[in-house]
Amino acid sequence: AAPCPDACCPHGSSGLRCTRDGALDSLHHLPGAENLTELYIENQQHLQHLELRDLRGLGELRNLTIVKSGLRFVAPDAFHFTPRLSRLNLSFNALESLSWKTVQGLSLQELVLSGNPLHCSCALRWLQRWEEEGLGGVPEQKLQCHGQGPLAHMPNASCGVPTLKVQVPNASVDVGDDVLLRCQVEGRGLEQAGWILTELEQSATVMKSGGLPSLGLTLANVTSDLNRKNVTCWAENDVGRAEVSVQVNVSFPASVQLHTAVEMHHWCIPFSVDGQPAPSLRWLFNGSVLNETSFIFTEFLEPAANETVRHGCLRLNQPTHVNNGNYTLLAANPFGQASASIMAAFMDNPFEFNPEDPIPVSFSPVDTNSTSGDPVEKKDETPFGVSVAVG
């Protein structure tokens, strides 16, 4: 193949090599950028900055090598458009630091930074941690800080992410109330802070106030939907990011729904109850208190993490005709009580038939001595005859 005279030449099916001395001062308009998976750059003294716009359109890039060049600064968001990047080699440049944000969100298998005049500071605490934890092939590089010794020996006692304290109301909140939350941020080198309110949707009207180090958030005219929703305060400094999530308890009255009985392993009368605090429940059968047993009992499904409603079943183990009737679920909490009723028919009464009807001659036995509401276990499936004298 003829030698490539351009600044950058194809390499394999989806690679590009840019090695001609001083030919590049930015990575704009690289040929065939959309399909590139590998980009190799060397000897580019004028390439000093790597920024967000430089790698736009390189969405398929897996391997990026910029070596023996003049790179001094890599923007924290430089790799936003290259989410698939797995190997990054920036060795033998003029980098004094590299933000933790630069590699956040990437799944880097390899990060090479040797041969840079790194300056030991808290901003490289994340890299020191990678070295400690054996990530990205960093330990093998024995990284040095320029004139300061090994990165591994950098004191880090004062290198912490921000500390957050979120003040929430110390009592429950009612529907329609306004709630003031305050996020107090402490720490060195604070850069940014804010609230993440993605879960709130229509749960309240949101008003933000203040800034570092004290952020205010008013949730106005709150609804019951605010329960179990995370309100998150976040802050960043040169060491990293901290988040603290809180939830606001919004009280509201009990409510209840009952659904038609369904036959599963046991019979189930499905119900849903809601309310904050969680309501206490009581069952009535034909208007009288239903005492639960090992045959008839309430069972809750696993609750969803982000809602107050609880779903469950009144379980009935092999119910008979004596269990047919009206089931009522009573729910109560401090702010309201509710009830719902449903008729359930599990089995026809075999002893209620018209003398004109054909006489059944064979069926499974039922223990007629049972007077309790508890279901009866079938002990023997053998059919037997019945003689009925009709007067």
């Epitope: 110390n170 109330d177 206490s280 909490n333 401090p334 702010f335």
Partner: antibody, heavy 123, light 106 residues
Framework: EVQLLESGGGLVQPGGSLRLSCAAS????????MSWVRQTPGKRLEWVAY????????YYPDTVKGRFTISRDNSKNTLYLQMNSLRAEDTAVYYC????????????????WGQGTTVTVSS | QIVLTQSPATLSLSPGERATLSCSAS?????MHWYQQKPGQSPRLLIY???NLASGIPSRFSGSGSGTDFTLTISSLEPEDAADYYC?????????FGGGTKLEIK
């Protein structure tokens, strides 16, 4: 010092109306729930109405629901109880009471009560 | 609604004696609160959420219980303890009070 001062009580005929007021001082009124509780001539205590801190939620027992309305004006530190369609059985001393705040708990009691105002419903 | 039944209706004891006042709920409740009312005065919070002493209340007062049975105990009676005592539940709507126990000091 927390102070709650009720006013507006008096003698009213059955079917009539009254509006009770409760002036609050000594605490940040807008950050506490408030309630009205009455005491019958037989000395029984009955909860009558509850209102949330901002006034967005109100609760009543069935005995007064639809007849009584609780409200508040946080700018004036004042709680109100509008009583309509009054009956003889509404005769009582009416207390306004401040909700307590003991941790993040729904079951807080009423920690301060006013001296009460007497409502007599009689023809 | 949850009915609170207090017993005894009247209790007559001497100073220094121990007083035990009971409150029984018709259904299980999470907590019980207790109030004291002296003649001509408004009720005053004594015990909140079953066993916590309200501000300014002497330590001779204590509360206990769970479920449906709750107790207010005064370990050593003082003459100023003569009053009506009410239990109160806020666990289940509507919020209710007991009928009261009248404590007399001989």
């Amino acid at each position: 010092e927390v102070q709650l001062l009720e006013s507006g009580g008096g003698l009213v005929q059955p079917g009539g109306s009254l509006r009770l007021s409760c002036a609050a001082s000594g605490f940040t009124f807008s950050t506490y729930t408030m309630s009205w509780v009455r005491q019958t001539p037989g000395k029984r205590l009955e909860w009558v109405a509850y209102i949330s801190k901002g006034g967005g939620s109100t609760y009543y027992p069935d005995t007064v629901k639809g007849r009584f309305t609780i409200s508040r004006d946080n700018s004036k530190n004042t709680l109100y109880l509008q009583m309509n369609s009054l009956r003889a059985e509404d005769t009582a001393v009416y207390y306004c009471a401040k909700g307590a705040m003991y941790g993040n708990d729904f079951f807080y009691p009423m920690d301060y009560w006013g001296q009460g105002t007497t409502v007599t419903v009689s023809s | 609604q949850i009915v609170l039944t207090q017993s005894p209706a009247t209790l007559s004891l001497s100073p220094g004696e121990r007083a035990t006042l009971s409150c029984s709920a018709s259904s299980s409740v999470s907590y019980m609160h207790w109030y004291q009312q002296k003649p001509g005065q408004s009720p005053r919070l004594l015990i909140y959420t079953t066993s916590n002493l309200a501000s300014g209340i002497p330590s001779r007062f204590s509360g206990s219980g769970s479920g449906t049975d709750f107790t207010l105990t005064i370990s050593s009676l003082e003459p100023e303890d003569a009053a009506d005592y009410y239990c109160h539940q806020w666990s289940s709507y509507p919020w209710t009070f007991g009928g009261g126990t009248k404590l007399e000091i001989k």
